[in-house]
């Protein structure tokens, strides 16, 4: 059984202010069971951007159906980007538990925000 990998194919993404940013992430295995979460930054101060199973994230939508059996595409789209959204985003796989246990993180995708074209 191959070891789970979390793949973020783009090291960086540049988006104009006001547009939407797509952050890509795929997993190589459905096992073990557990959610994907997206964070900005690392360490204890990291910011939760999206949780696959719970919470309300009005600017974030999954690119693929998170409820679909066998879905391994955990890419997200963030709307109405502002300069405050700049940073490095990590797609992180957790193992289901009480609480969920962090298993593996993607390498991160740096989001840079360009000035809105005049």
């Amino acid at each position: 059984e191959e070891e789970l990998q979390v793949i973020q194919p783009e090291k960086s993404v540049s988006v104009a202010a006001g547009e939407s940013a797509t952050l890509n992430c795929t997993a190589t295995s459905l096992i073990p069971v557990g959610p994907i979460q997206w964070f900005r930054g690392v360490g204890p101060g990291r910011e939760l951007i999206y949780h696959q199973k719970e919470g309300h994230f009005p600017r974030v939508t999954p690119v693929s159906d998170p409820t679909k059996r066998n879905n391994m595409d955990f890419s997200i789209r963030i709307s109405n980007i502002t300069p405050a959204d700049a940073g490095t985003y990590y797609c992180v796989k957790f193992r289901k538990g009480s609480p969920d246990v962090e298993l593996k993180s993607g390498a991160g995708t740096e989001l840079s925000v360009r000035a809105k074209p005049s």
Epitope: D65, T67, R69
Partner: antibody, heavy 124, light 106 residues
Framework: AVTLDESGGGLQTPGGALSLVCKGS????????MNWVRQAPGKGLEWVAG????????YYGAAVQGRATISRDNGQSTVRLQLNNLRAEDTATYYC?????????????????WGHGTEVIVSS | ALTQPASVSANPGETVEITCSGG?????YGWFQQKSPGSAPLTVI????KRPSDIPSRFSGSKSDSTGTLTITRVQAEDEAVYYC??????????FGAGTTLTVLG
């Protein structure tokens, strides 16, 4: 009790269009994916289309791809199947189904409830 | 399509197993009972082994490797029906088996 009531069947003309509606009750409609399944006379079950609980994601069987549109109105607890360019092969009983808290459209292993069905006959 | 036997038979009180294979990798199976053509199917097992509240405990489901199994213990005459399995293939499309006719002898 969970109920799924289909309507909109009947005699249809080849090349025409039909619109089937399923009204759900007895459960939190917006929390469950829904599917349409059909059964031609004397044949087995065939998956037609499915839709995620929030309506953002839709799925279609090969036999109706490009001719069908599935949609839902969670406020009205309804799911609709529109099928265009009808053929004789679309003659069947169409069942509305509910997923039981797992999976999405196309995940037939998750179906936990069925409607009574509505009969569609495509004939000139 | 999923693969299931065309027919099985059992005497009342016996245990019968119906198998289903061909679903996508890591997928689950559901089982649907249809007592007569044109009558609405009834879910007896979903998500491999979950049983709707109105289904007797004589019905159980399991999955080993990529094969799903419906087990009916203490078979009764009223269990005579066609049983369909359902799942999704690797592309995510819904698929059914062709159906297994259960005949209760005697």
């Amino acid at each position: 009790a969970v109920t799924l009531d289909e309507s909109g069947g009947g005699l249809q003309t080849p090349g025409g269009a039909l619109s089937l509606v399923c009204k759900g009750s007895g459960f939190t409609f917006s929390s469950h994916a829904m599917n349409w399944v059909r059964q031609a006379p004397g044949k087995g079950l065939e998956w037609v289309a499915g839709i995620s609980s929030d309506g953002r994601f839709t799925y279609y069987g090969a036999a109706v791809q490009g001719r069908a549109t599935i949609s839902r109105d969670n406020g009205q607890s309804t799911v609709r199947l529109q099928l265009n360019n009808l053929r004789a092969e679309d003659t069947a009983t169409y069942y509305c189904t509910k997923n039981g808290g797992c999976g999405s459209g196309g995940d037939l292993d998750c179906i936990d409830a069925w409607g009574h069905g509505t009969e569609v006959i495509v004939s000139s | 399509a999923l693969t299931q036997p065309a027919s099985v038979s059992a005497n009342p009180g016996e245990t019968v197993e119906i198998t289903c294979s061909g679903g996508g990798s890591n997928n689950a199976y559901g089982w649907f009972q249809q007592k007569s053509p044109g009558s609405a199917p009834l879910t007896v097992i979903y998500d491999n082994g979950k049983r709707p509240s109105d289904i007797p405990s004589r019905f159980s489901g399991s999955k080993s490797d990529s094969t799903g199994t419906l087990t009916i213990t203490r078979v009764q005459a009223e269990d005579e029906a066609v049983y369909y399995c359902g799942s999704a293939d690797n592309s995510g499309a819904g698929v059914f088996g062709a159906g297994t006719t259960l005949t209760v002898l005697g």
